[in-house]
């Protein structure tokens, strides 16, 4: 599940990873847009595990994870869901 | 420091049934997805199963699901395959292997390995 | 299932050769392609998790490369304790698999 948050909170991310997870250990992504006190776009992965690591959004695994679930969202296929939330 | 010690192997006949057992030290056991995986003689690895913590999500390779069980006890830190109606080519070390799931994703230790035989 | 077609299935090489082995996914990985190490009568040891990092302890000369489809395992100076058999593995997605190895040896 592929979810974009618009938030007035300041950066979560302190630390970013680049290592690849696979999609089986991923309950959701979370991507908070630049802007409302963050100047950098971040990814939050949720975990199946219930941890969280933040992914550092120049990663080149996730953007492939990206581009493939913007794919399947702009098919029939009902896969990712995308949330704004707007405060 | 991290110790997997698998054991159950043995000789049995063609048919037969065979439970290996995997004994965990050193790790917090309950957090951690587990897999059997096995090499037969002179060949490469084959992936068997996997295993999640709380035991509710298992994976098979899709030529052993119907023979072949795999199953964890946390409070004995703990992990087991049991095999059923073993063919000669079930014949391999079979080893036991933690997937981590917290930073690298990949099997990060691997215990010594079990043969197991199956001949008559 | 996803086939990881490994390349070559053995080499000879000298002490401090450049020695690079080949994986290709037969559909998309991303980079969910680890490398391990295996010395005769031994387990596998983990070298290389995502692609190209080198796991806790892994020497500076073994590196790993490649996204999708194509990988790549380098030893930059072959030493005499690298002798093993070397084998990728795909973790992108399950039934999880393994390349079919390769055969170090010394020349």
């Known amino acids: 599940v592929l979810e974009v948050y618009y938030t007035s909170l300041r950066c979560r991310c302190v630390q970013e990873s680049s290592v690849f997870i696979p999609r089986r250990f991923i309950d959701r992504i979370q991507i908070l847009p630049r802007g409302n006190g963050c100047p950098r776009k971040e990814i939050i992965v949720w975990k199946k595990n219930k941890s969280i690591v933040c992914v550092d959004p120049q990663a080149e695994w996730i953007q492939r994870m990206m581009e493939v679930l913007r794919k399947r969202s702009s098919s029939t296929l009902p896969v990712p869901v995308f949330k704004r939330k707007i405060p | 420091e991290v110790q997997l010690v698998e054991s159950g192997g043995g000789l049995v006949q063609p048919g037969g049934s065979l439970r290996l057992s995997c004994a965990a030290s050193?790790?917090?056991?309950?957090?951690?997805?587990m897999s059997w995986v096995r090499q037969a003689p002179g060949k490469g690895l084959e992936w068997v199963a996997e295993?999640?913590?709380?035991?509710?999500?298992?994976n098979y390779a899709p030529s052993l699901k119907d023979r072949f069980t795999i199953s964890r006890d946390n409070a004995k830190n703990s992990l087991y395959l049991q095999m059923n109606s073993l063919r000669a080519e079930d014949t391999a070390v079979y080893y036991c292997?933690?997937?981590?799931?917290?930073?690298?994703?990949?099997?990060?230790?691997w215990g010594q390995g079990t043969t197991v035989t199956v001949s008559s | 299932d996803i086939q990881m077609t490994q390349s070559p299935s053995s080499l000879s090489a000298s002490v401090g050769d450049r020695v690079t082995i080949t994986c290709k996914a037969s559909q998309d990985v991303n980079t969910g392609v680890a490398w391990y190490q295996q010395k005769p009568g031994k387990a596998p040891k983990l070298l290389i998790y995502s692609a190209s990092y080198r796991y806790t302890g892994v020497p500076s000369r073994f590196s790993g490369s490649g996204s999708g489809t194509d990988f790549t395992f380098t030893i930059s100076s072959l030493q005499p304790e690298d002798i093993a058999t070397y084998y990728c593995?795909?973790?992108?997605?399950?039934?999880?698999?393994f390349g079919g190895g390769t055969k170090l040896e010394i020349k």
């Open positions: 050193g790790i917090d056991f309950s957090r951690y997805w």
């Open positions: 295993i999640n913590p709380e035991s509710s999500t298992i």
């Open positions: 292997a933690r997937q981590d799931d917290t930073r690298y994703y990949a099997m990060d230790y």
């Open positions: 593995q795909q973790y992108y997605s399950t039934p999880l698999t």
